[in-house]
Amino acid sequence: MRWCLLLIWAQGLRQAPLASGMMTGTIETTGNISAEKGGSIILQCHLSSTTAQVTQVNWEQQDQLLAICNADLGWHISPSFKDRVAPGPGLGLTLQSLTVNDTGEYFCIYHTYPDGTYTGRIFLEVLESSVAEHGARFQIPLLGAMAATLVVICTAVIVVVALTRKKKALRIHSVEGDLRRKSAGQEEWSPSAPSPPGSCVQAEAAPAGLCGEQRGEDCAELHDYFNVLSYRSLGNCSFFTETG
């Protein structure tokens, strides 16, 4: 039995309206999403705030059933979609090889006992590749220009600081030469030695840190934040709900 992590995306996160006041559960969905033609997308819903037992989850398009995950029977994919639809992650559904015709409403329907049926709605817009490519063509040079600007600024700062320190070092060398000779056993601080805190070498490294490590930490935080529950999928489709 595989354990899959249920990803609930922040963008477009919303609560679906419920059919009855007696039903306490809420469905969170990915809301309105867009994807590139030929690409893939994960449709996700999450039922929370109810102790009802989930017996089946349906994934439906406007006029057809895409897939079902039944507590007893496991996953079943529509024969029409078996080449383009993959179950999971979790109780979600992955749509592959997207076409413009895939644009439209998608529904996740949770069949529960004793509450009844909870429905979530997701609107998917599939964009032509050229739209995404145009965006990329615009963004890449922009990022390149920003990076180049940072490099130039940082290089200039390094040069200025290095020259300033060299001048200081020369002055110190000429005025206090004998003091340096007395402390010859101590490590000299020169531009070639490791830079102290606050120097431009660290500042130069900062853009890489911000664009690399920092972003990675952000991603890890988001990953940890949204992957709060794990779901058993495929096999017998065990369902869990969060009662908080």
Partner: nanobody, 121 residues
């Protein structure tokens, strides 16, 4: 394959009511929607009403709107057609249909054997 069995047909006077039932069996998890069609003598089979199995959305032919009501009991895998204010032109064989994976409004994959409804004037 999904099997469908209708019941509830019969003879009724104009203005009267009837309730048709259709029980589904087999791999009912694959049902997208269920509904009713009818075929009057010498005419083509026509759509009457349907309901999306899981969401409860309902659709009706203009000729029956306001008089017929379709409903479903998912727990019993049964769909019902409540027919009120019946007219002689409602006389026909009523067929239950199940759209397996796809909507029966596009292609009805499974059919019941039909039940006769006769409205006398």
């Amino acid at each position: 394959e999904v099997q469908l069995v209708e019941s509830g047909g019969g003879l009724v006077q104009a203005g009267g009511s009837l309730r048709l039932s259709c029980a589904a069996s087999g791999p009912t998890f694959s049902i997208y929607d269920m509904g009713w069609f009818r075929q009057a003598p010498g005419k083509e089979r026509e759509f009457v009403a349907s309901t999306i199995w899981s969401r409860g959305d309902t659709y009706y032919a203009d000729s029956v709107k306001g008089r017929f009501t379709i409903s479903a009991d998912n727990a019993k895998n049964t769909v019902y057609l409540q027919m009120n204010s019946l007219k002689p032109e409602d006389t026909a064989v009523y067929y239950c249909a199940a759209g397996v994976w796809s909507s029966l409004r596009h292609t009805a994959a499974n059919w019941g054997q039909g039940t006769q409804v006769t409205v006398s004037s």
